[in-house]
């Protein structure tokens, strides 16, 4: 027989099928031109040694072979013995270690027979009442097709399912959608209508996330905050990747989970923008103040569950870096500056109160002054911090105040509102004899106690009411009495007591008489 | 491992008051953060409060006022106080552990370790 042509004798080896579980399958034969056909297949299993042979039966029941070699594609014309307008049925016998093995039959006609792509090029994934509609546009020049898929998950084999009869320049196919597990698709078309045509090959995969993206599984941790005003985010464990069937592992476009931090900064309530979402891969640096955090997982169908998180705020007080001075046009702040064109927010609330309550107030970017110090002053009118409490105070700084991730905070500290200097003055000054020549005095705690760091000293004042003679006594804030010692018998004295902040020299408390009584011996 | 056990619960009519308390082992509890979720038969489970290792709290705003958390490191030991209690408080209450610093999960996924409950009823 010459190659080219159908040989109608017995093919050189026996005729009989081993059974095998490998061997050629997925056999593909159709019209390439005028007057030329092609058959292509697939052999699953060692290859080496192999022989293949495209079987052909007529409908006349003459049978015919084409002997291919190693090779899984042949082509032959109109004139090669095989009947192209009538039904032919075609396999492929390989034979291989001393057994032969067949292909499943295909019946066609062969001029009818056009060779059908695949779906080629995008795509589209998209969700639909609970399941899922793919859609593409049709190959060129083959509009009328039978579609199906096979789809299959990381534990699951490969299971067909069929999209029906396609009709138009665009295809579409509904499959089932998973709830929690990720799948891979692929597609094939045939010719509609035309008995027997050969299937195309399978698309390339098409890989789809569940329904529901995983629920991120992170853990957190926030550094202390630094010197800058600012503290570290850190991420302790990433989120859990999602498990791929085969074919969608390694660069899987359509099945990537989407992890976005979302940051609600709870302080400061002024401020132009207060949320800020960032991919999760960017830890971001924060300032000291009360946060809460989300992290949001999301697939090209939605969002799913989110965590969250609070961060409280730093309350960590600088006793020191801020100076208040109250004159009589209203109060002045005074801090170190950081940097040029700074906006500040400056935040008060009074203590032992809801966070919510806090009040604050933005200023306009500003340079340092001479001194290297920004500022905030408020009137008496404005009733701001006007309550004589204790108020606790945080400010915060950006060049960029729209920027949520930018603000960093300058200090914490506390501050008695109103006229601290009258509301702090010590109340209840009791005098008791202590020797013949000293006596104790005590008092209740200034108001300003109430205010870490807020009261500087307590201060006794002691006159001599025959000689006019006054004496002071520092007291350290967290002591209530003294002993005054070197006093005279039968001499009148009057004591007073102060309390003073460090910007703020405090109202002596009513004065308050006593003497020593002369002591008569018997 | 940490463990968790919760004591506590039981039956108290509406506007009374509980003190729920938490008992941690096997860690080394000042570092970790600890919580209080809730939970209605059928239904999600909800933070309720949070306290840091250096005692930093947060409150669900539907508690905020009217329950205070706080710790005692040295017994290892977390406590809810509940006072007020309305009907819609009634819930299981779990106890709940998460080896981090400075922040509060508000969901139950951000937590690690979790007590078997104690039974919080309020009656009208």
């Known amino acids: 027989c010459r190659t080219s042509e159908c040989c109608f004798q017995d093919p050189p080896y026996p005729d009989a099928d081993s059974g095998s579980a490998s061997g050629p399958r997925d056999l593909r034969c159709y019209r390439i031109s005028s007057d030329r056909y092609e058959c292509s297949w697939q052999y699953e299993g060692p290859t080496a040694g192999v022989s293949h042979f495209l079987r052909c039966c007529l409908s006349s029941g003459r049978c015919c072979y084409f002997a291919a070699g190693s090779a899984t594609r042949l082509q032959f014309s109109d004139q090669a013995g095989v009947s192209v307008l009538y039904t032919v049925t075609l396999w492929v016998e390989s034979w291989a270690r001393n057994q032969t093995e067949k292909s499943p039959e295909v019946t066609l006609q062969l001029y009818n027979s056009v060779k059908y792509e695949p779906p080629l090029g995008d795509i589209k994934v998209s969700k639909l009442a609970g399941q899922l509609r793919m859609e593409w546009e049709t190959p060129d020049n083959q509009v009328g097709a039978e579609v199906q898929f096979r789809h299959r998950t990381p534990s699951s084999p490969w299971k067909l399912g069929d999209c029906g009869p396609q009709d138009d320049d665009t295809e579409s196919c509904l499959c089932p959608l998973e709830m929690n597990v990720a799948q891979e698709f692929q597609l094939r078309r045939r010719q509609l209508g035309s008995q027997g045509s050969s299937w195309s090959k399978w698309s390339s995969p098409v890989c789809v996330p569940p329904e529901n993206p995983p629920q991120p599984q992170v853990r957190f941790s926030v550094e202390q905050l630094g010197q800058d005003g600012r503290r570290r985010l850190t991420l302790k464990e990433q989120p859990t990747q999602l498990e791929l069937p085969e074919g969608c592992q390694g660069l899987a476009p359509g099945t990537e989970v989407t992890y976005r931090l979302q940051l609600h900064m709870l302080s400061c309530p002024c401020k132009a923008k207060a949320t800020r979402t960032l991919h999760l891969g960017k830890m971001p640096y924060l300032s000291g103040a009360a946060y809460n955090v989300a992290v949001i997982s999301s697939n090209q169908f939605g969002p799913g569950l989110n965590q969250t998180w609070h961060i409280p705020a730093d309350t960590h007080t600088e006793p020191v870096a801020l100076n208040i001075s109250v004159g009589t046009n209203g109060t002045t702040m005074y801090w170190p500056a950081r940097a040029q064109s700074m906006t500040y927010c400056i935040e008060w609330q009074p203590v032992g109160q809801d966070g919510g309550l806090a009040t604050c107030s933005l200023t306009a970017p500003q340079d340092p002054d001479p001194a290297g110090m920004a500022t905030y002053s408020w009137s008496r009118e404005s009733g701001a911090m006007g309550q004589e409490k204790c108020y606790y105070i945080t400010i915060f700084a950006s060049a960029h105040p729209e920027k949520l991730t930018l603000w960093s905070t300058v200090l914490s500290t506390y501050h008695f509102g109103g006229n601290a200097s009258a509301a702090g003055t010590p109340h209840h000054v009791s005098v008791k004899n202590h020797s013949l020549d000293s006596v104790s005095v005590d008092w209740a705690p200034s108001l300003l106690s109430t205010c870490p760091g807020v009261l500087k000293e307590y201060v006794v004042r002691c006159r001599d009411e025959d000689s006019k003679q006054v004496s002071e006594h520092p007291v350290q804030p967290t002591e209530t009495q003294v002993t005054l010692s070197g006093l005279r018998a039968g001499v009148a004295y009057t004591v007073q007591v102060r309390a003073d902040t460090a910007w703020l020299r405090g109202v002596w408390s009513q004065p308050q008489r006593f003497s020593i009584e002369v002591q008569v011996s018997d | 491992q940490v463990q968790l056990v919760e004591s506590g619960g039981g039956l108290v009519q509406a506007g009374g008051s509980l003190r729920l308390s938490c008992a941690a082992s096997?860690?080394?509890?000042?570092?970790?953060?600890m919580g209080w979720f809730r939970q209605v038969s059928g239904k999600e489970r909800e933070f309720v409060a949070g306290?840091?290792?250096?005692?930093?709290?947060y409150f669900a705003d539907s508690v905020k006022g009217r329950f205070t958390i706080s710790r005692d490191n040295a017994k290892n030991m977390v406590y809810l106080q509940m006072n007020s209690l309305k009907p819609e408080d009634t819930a299981v209450y779990y106890c709940?552990?998460?080896?981090?610093?400075?922040?509060?999960?508000?969901?139950?996924?951000?937590?690690?370790?979790w007590g078997k409950g104690t039974l919080v009823t309020v009656s009208s």
């Open positions: 306290i840091t290792g250096i005692s930093s709290t």
């Open positions: 096997g860690g080394p509890f000042s570092g970790y953060v």
């Open positions: 709940a552990a998460v080896n981090s610093f400075g922040v509060i999960p508000t969901s139950p996924n951000g937590m690690d370790y």
